[in-house]
């Protein structure tokens, strides 16, 4: 979970406990099982570039 008192992630991003930072939801297109992708499911991601695994 995000540490208490920290600012929430900006729109189009979600918190990753695995990485300890906010992650761009567009990255879920590279690795859909990343931990932060659950937090991205409710909102559409920011514009993305589709590249590799």
């Amino acid at each position: 979970e995000q540490a208490p008192g920290t600012a929430p992630c900006s729109r189009g991003s979600s918190w990753s406990a695995d990485l300890d930072k906010c992650m761009d939801c567009a990255s879920c297109r590279a690795r859909p099982h990343s931990d932060f992708c659950l937090g991205c499911a409710a909102a559409p991601p920011a514009p993305f570039r589709l590249l590799w695994p």
């Epitope: 990753s16 406990a17 695995d18 990485l19 300890d20 992650m23 761009d24 567009a26 990255s27 879920c28 297109r29 590279a30 690795r31 859909p32 099982h33 990343s34 993305f48 570039r49 589709l50 590249l51 590799w52 695994p53």
Partner: antibody
Framework: QVQLVQSGAEVKKPGASVKVSCKAS????????IAWVKQAPGQGLEWIGE????????YYSEKFRGKATLTADTSTSTAYMELSSLRSEDTAVYFC?????????????WGQGTLVTVSS | DIVMTQSPLSLPVTPGEPASISCRSS???????????LYWYLQKPGQSPQLLIY???NLASGVPDRFSGSGSGTDFTLKISRVEAEDVGVYYC?????????FGQGTKVEIK
């Protein structure tokens, strides 16, 4: 350029442990996952597990839980895999590989492999 | 776990001729986002695996365009339009839909 350089070949006796290293360079070590893959002689590729170096969080294949322990040292940009209670079936080449979490990533990178031989 | 099954396991080829390898997954690799998480790797003799195709049909950087990938949710094909001598090695399909990361058994491509 991105490079993963693994430690040299090891010969171990049954019951011993071995620690294989994977030194990363050419990128920010904490921003990418390091996975470990086993290739037994003449066999295919088998995922062991992976680590997020920045947090130390790990994910393991059920088959290797208790056999492999993954760690990372961010001060030296080096990932480690320790294999315990070695048996003959642990004889294999072990690869580390950089995997991504990002959408703007141009390919994946593998170490050269480390041969671990378990023999009495 | 998702099981990846390849065929054939051995493929003798003639330089200049086409070749194809099949891969089947035990679960659909088509995600709700519209992307199919199927990858192809080539392991040349004595080397580490290298990525050829990502997300079923996209050519990885530096890979010759004689390679192509296609398929559906569970059935996939890697095609080489004209085999060259440097294409020998073991080809693996793999998925990136979830953990664990699993690979096919491999298809050994060798020159006739």
């Amino acid at each position: 350029q991105v490079q993963l350089v693994q430690s040299g070949a090891e010969v171990k006796k049954p019951g011993a442990s071995v620690k294989v290293s994977c030194k990363a360079s050419g990128y920010t070590f904490t921003d990418f996952i390091i996975a470990w893959v086993k290739q037994a002689p003449g066999q295919g590729l088998e995922w062991i597990g992976e680590i997020y170096p920045g947090t130390g969080r790990t994910y393991y294949s059920e088959k290797f839980r208790g056999k492999a322990t993954l760690t990372a040292d961010t001060s030296t940009s080096t990932a480690y895999m320790e294999l315990s209670s070695l048996r003959s079936e642990d004889t294999a080449v072990y690869f580390c590989a950089r995997r991504t979490i990002y959408y703007d990533y141009d390919g994946d990178y593998w170490g050269q492999g480390t041969l671990v031989t378990v023999s009495s | 776990d998702i099981v990846m099954t390849q065929s054939p396991l051995s493929l003798p080829v003639t330089p200049g001729e086409p070749a194809s390898i099949s891969c089947r997954s035990s679960k659909s690799l088509l995600h709700s986002n519209g992307i199919t998480y199927l990858y192809w790797y080539l392991q040349k003799p004595g080397q580490s695996p290298q990525l050829l195709i990502y997300q079923m049909s996209n050519l990885a950087s530096g890979v010759p365009d004689r390679f192509s990938g296609s398929g559906s949710g569970t059935d996939f094909t890697l095609k080489i339009s004209r085999v060259e001598a440097e294409d020998v090695g073991v080809y693996y399909c793999a998925h990136n839909l979830e953990l664990p990361w699993t690979f096919g058994q491999g298809t050994k491509v060798e020159i006739k």
